[in-house]
């Protein structure tokens, strides 16, 4: 199946992904066009076209020419200066900020609650399924199945430490190689990525942001699968992970460590333990195929406890069994033996909600799955709407320059290598290369960052995880201390050799390149985000799972042709753009197939089909709610709650009235203006720093 | 109080059977093995076998199997041996005893006993 | 089977003298010994069990003692209505079995 042509472009002419539109233009009757599209849904619309606007400002200017959609958006100004306040003005101002800095806060902290929160009910959801894929004994000579079981285990638990633990007490244990692991560690690298790709969904309501925040989330992705797709094979073939990391491993003086620090998690923990805690121990139980876990809860109901070893009368099959001989006897039917048991005394509940309901882990992990992505997509909605805010003026000018702004020459190249010591350093401190990552996610979408800036972040960020991992272990015990080490540090060096593939040469950082045709296919089909998701982190992975259970032959039968199709669609893309006269005429574009194979257009019609029927009740729940949302933020009564609200915005345009809400970072007054509802500013008005 | 109580003694012909009671009471019968035990003058005691009357399992001494039979009766909280084909070597007095000390093979409550004579 | 010996038939003692009774295993029974007490024309009662635990209502003169193979019942003061025949049983392996016994007589 060819690719789909707008994979090609990172940064086309927007008149070739926005339909329908040439230049930017105020709106006026154009009987040329008989139909229009804004959306994924075909709706014909008559005498009107509706263009995608940047900006309010725009609306009453001149026409311009639509800019660059990676061009990060001018953040405007649209309040009084400071110096022309009174001093009643400048103290509410303060507070105003004082205020908006407590709740941007608030919510960036709910936000880390409602990751942390999903990872544990992913854990419930999946957890030990997830635990039954590392109980296959054909990891040990599969690599690619191991990478796929770490992809698999990483995105059904939400947590790349946690798959890391099973695979580091399996190998203490003696259950898992070194060599075994290694595939595992890079697909949890792999399966870390989704979260933050995840929290990009949730700013599909805006395209323009859309584009930038997926693009800025998938990069991540990008850089994982392709280093994967060259350092697995490296490894395979060399074992250079496992050879760098047993000398360094065998070079150290080993002495039991402290505990790693706990940074983000001592703000965090106190908030998330009282909606559940997890009884980790499961999942890498079942791992070790101990049978007993399988009928224990992840939910831990017990949080204090006191272990005691006694000794204990057992009953034994026979003489053989005992202890010892002398040890032995009978009670004239059963024989009996002593025995070192340890039992759990239990002294106090844990004081989570879930802690008295006994409800299955099932219930339990959906309930919170629910709940953590809605309160996950209030926070990013409300962070995303307070910076907006906040960052406007010469604020925003100073944070932008600030952080995409390179070093001056002859030092320019530096500017990235900090950004991945940044990256890094942050990373550390909350912890998570999820939380990092995600936390970035909006800033992408909303302007303050550019994908460019955010791919070194991101590559800083695997590399924090990975020197978290390190310090946990050093602090593990005398038994695990070793493989726990050498497995933390082949997670440090494929990132970094990751890193020395994708990032040094501007030429290679590819991942950049995907990540923006992707958002630009996203922005055009928002569907094809989620299929995206589906296809990369369930599908493709749960294909390789079965074809590797199936056998080598199988995996080699299917596995090659497609690779075949693959190579031979990427050469003659290749080939199209750079010299199509090498090719003959049938060959120069992708007509000859039908439009099914090489288009997103026919399957937006059936997609959009599938959901017409949910689009009304979704636009009036929308609708609702982006009224309350007007109301508190004082947005004009032409709101444009939802882009699938289209009967609603072709009446008033039919009127004049321009349908366009304002952007996060859009001139209000000017937006009112055009809407005849122009008012004086006061004191209370958006204050602008100096 | 715990009681075993035992018929005082059982004449049978050489060749014929004898099944033997030991009725329970003062404690859950069905939670405590019943042992039996032969004691003659001149073997002094010897061990035939116990029986845990809660499941029916039984445990015999191999020098009394096919000679004794344990059965226990749980609605009526008795114990049974029966001695098959019986000869002169038979007679003894045989007690019925339980141990309430659970993991071990020590009887601390005793019947009292019955005395079997096997003559023509 | 494992073969319980009690060197001593009888015992001729005194009120208040200090009665020592053996019993030897003819294997390793651990401490899984007890100590009977019988007298004429009664059913057996229990003194001792794992080799020294008391059994309730039996008096503290009565003490028990080894392991492996070899045990001793003591009666630190003998008294009158001690006089009995006393013995052993192992219960560390099926079948159980027991001591021949040994009688105490007055002198």
């Known amino acids: 199946m060819a690719p789909w042509p707008e994979l090609g472009d990172a940064q086309p002419n927007p008149s070739k992904y926005l339909e329908g539109a040439t230049s930017q233009q105020p709106i006026t009757p154009d009987k040329s066009k008989e139909t229009n599209k804004t959306d994924n849904t075909e709706v014909p619309v008559t005498k009107f076209e509706l263009l995608p606007t940047y900006s309010t400002a725009t609306l009453i200017e001149e026409p311009t020419e639509v800019d660059d959609p990676w061009n990060l958006p001018t953040l405007q100004d649209s309040g009084i200066k400071w110096s022309e306040r009174d001093a009643k003005g400048k103290i509410l101002c303060v507070f105003q900020g004082i205020g908006r800095l407590i709740l941007l806060l608030g919510f960036l902290y709910f936000f880390v609650c409602s990751l942390d929160v999903l990872s544990s009910a992913f854990q419930l959801v999946g957890g030990k399924m997830a635990g039954q894929f590392f109980s296959n004994s054909s990891i040990m000579s599969n690599p690619l199945l191991g990478l796929v079981i770490g992809v698999l285990v990483t995105v059904f638990v939400q947590s790349s430490s946690t798959s890391t633990s099973i695979v580091v007490s399996m190998v203490a244990s003696s259950l898992l190689t070194v060599r075994a692991a290694i595939p595992i560690i890079m697909g949890a690298n792999i399966g870390t990525s989704i979260t933050n790709t995840i929290v990009a969904l949730m700013q599909v309501g805006d395209r323009s942001e859309f584009r930038r925040a997926f693009a800025g989330a998938t990069v991540h992705d990008f850089f994982n699968w392709l280093s994967v797709l060259v350092l697995l094979p490296v490894e395979v073939a060399t074992h250079y992970l496992e050879v760098v990391t047993q000398l360094i491993v065998e070079s150290f003086h080993f002495k039991n460590g402290e505990d790693a620090p706990d940074l983000l998690k001592v703000i965090t923990k106190p908030f998330t333990k009282l909606i559940v805690q997890l009884d980790k121990k499961v999942i890498s139980q079942i791992a070790m195929n101990d049978e007993t876990a399988k009928n224990k809860s992840l939910v831990k109901i017990w949080c204090k406890t006191f272990t005691n070893m006694t000794q204990m009368n057992v009953t034994v099959p026979s003489m053989a069994n005992c202890t010892s001989p002398s040890l032995c006897w009978t009670d004239g039917i059963q024989i009996w033996t002593m025995k070192n048991v340890t039992y759990k005394e239990n002294i106090a509940k844990c004081q989570h909600i879930f802690v008295n309901f006994h409800l299955p882990d099932l219930a339990v992990g959906i309930i919170l799955l629910i709940i953590s992505l809605l309160v996950l997509c209030g926070c990013l909605i409300m962070i995303v709407k307070i910076l907006g805010s906040v960052l406007k003026g010469q604020v925003a000018t100073v944070i932008k320059k600030t952080i995409n702004t390179d070093f001056p020459f002859p030092f320019a190249w530096l500017t990235g290598y900090l950004a991945i010591l940044v990256g890094a350093g942050m990373t550390f401190i909350v912890q998570s290369s999820s939380v990092f990552t995600s936390a970035l996610t909006p800033l992408i979408g909303i302007g303050v960052i550019t994908i460019e800036r955010a791919y070194p972040l991101t590559l800083g960020s695997n590399i924090g995880t990975t020197t978290t991992a390190i310090l946990a272990a050093l602090a593990s015990p005398g038994n695990t201390l070793r493989s726990s080490l050498q497995i933390a540090l082949c997670h440090f060096f494929f990132n970094i050799s990751g890193i020395l593939l994708w990032y040094p040469i501007p030429f290679t950082r590819l991942p950049i390149r995907m990540a923006k045709g992707l958002g630009n296919i996203s922005a055009k089909y928002r569907w094809f985000a989620i299929f995206y998701l589906i296809i990369f982190f369930f599908l493709i992975p749960l294909t390789v799972f079965g074809l590797s259970l199936a056998g080598w032959p199988v995996l080699v039968g299917v596995g090659v042709p497609v690779v075949f199709i693959i190579i031979l669609v990427l050469c003659l893309r290749l080939l199209q753009s750079r010299c199509p006269r090498v090719l003959p005429k049938k060959l120069q574009n992708w007509n000859f197939l039908p439009l099914c194979m090489h288009s997103l257009k026919p399957w937006d019609a059936v997609i959009s089909k599938f959901t017409g029927p949910f689009q009304m009740p979704c636009c009036c729940c929308c609708r609702v709610c982006c009224r309350v949302c007007c109301l508190l933020c004082g947005c004009p009564k032409c709101c444009r709650c939802s882009k699938c609200c289209q009967d609603l915005e072709e009446g008033q345009e039919a009127q004049g009235v321009p349908v366009k809400a304002p952007e996060t970072f859009d001139n209000i007054t000017i937006s009112r203006e055009a809407q005849g509802e122009v008012r004086a500013p006061d004191s209370k008005t958006e204050c602008t720093a100096l | 109080q715990v009681q075993l109580q035992q018929p005082g003694a059982e004449l049978v012909k050489p060749g014929a059977s004898v099944k033997m009671s030991c009725r329970t009471s003062g404690y859950t019968f069905i939670t405590y093995n019943m042992h039996w035990v032969k004691q003659t003058p001149g073997q002094g005691r010897e061990w035939i076998g116990a029986?845990?009357?809660?499941?029916?399992?039984?445990s015999y001494n191999q020098k009394f199997k096919g000679k004794a039979t344990l059965t226990a009766d749980k609605s009526s909280s008795t114990a049974y041996m029966q001695l098959n084909s019986l000869t002169s070597e038979d007679s003894a007095v045989y007690y019925c005893?339980?141990?309430?000390?659970?993991?071990?093979?020590?009887?601390?409550?005793w019947g009292q006993g019955t005395s079997v004579t096997v003559a023509s | 089977d494992i073969v319980m010996t009690q060197s001593h038939k009888f015992m001729s003692t005194s009120v208040g003298d200090r009665v020592s009774i053996t019993c030897k295993a003819s294997q390793d029974v651990g401490t899984a010994v007890a100590w009977y007490q019988q007298k004429a024309g009664q059913s057996p009662k229990l003194l001792i069990y794992?080799?020294?635990t008391r059994h309730t209502g039996v008096p503290d003169r009565f003490t028990g003692s080894g392991s492996g193979t070899d045990f001793t019942l003591i009666i630190r003061s003998l008294q009158s209505e001690d006089l009995a025949d006393y013995f052993c049983q192992q219960y560390s392996r099926i079948p159980l079995t027991f001591g021949s016994g040994t009688k105490l007589e007055i002198k």
């Open positions: 005893s339980i141990s309430t000390i659970i993991t071990t093979g020590a009887v601390d409550y």
């Open positions: 029986i845990y009357p809660g499941s029916g399992d039984t």
């Open positions: 794992w080799t020294s």
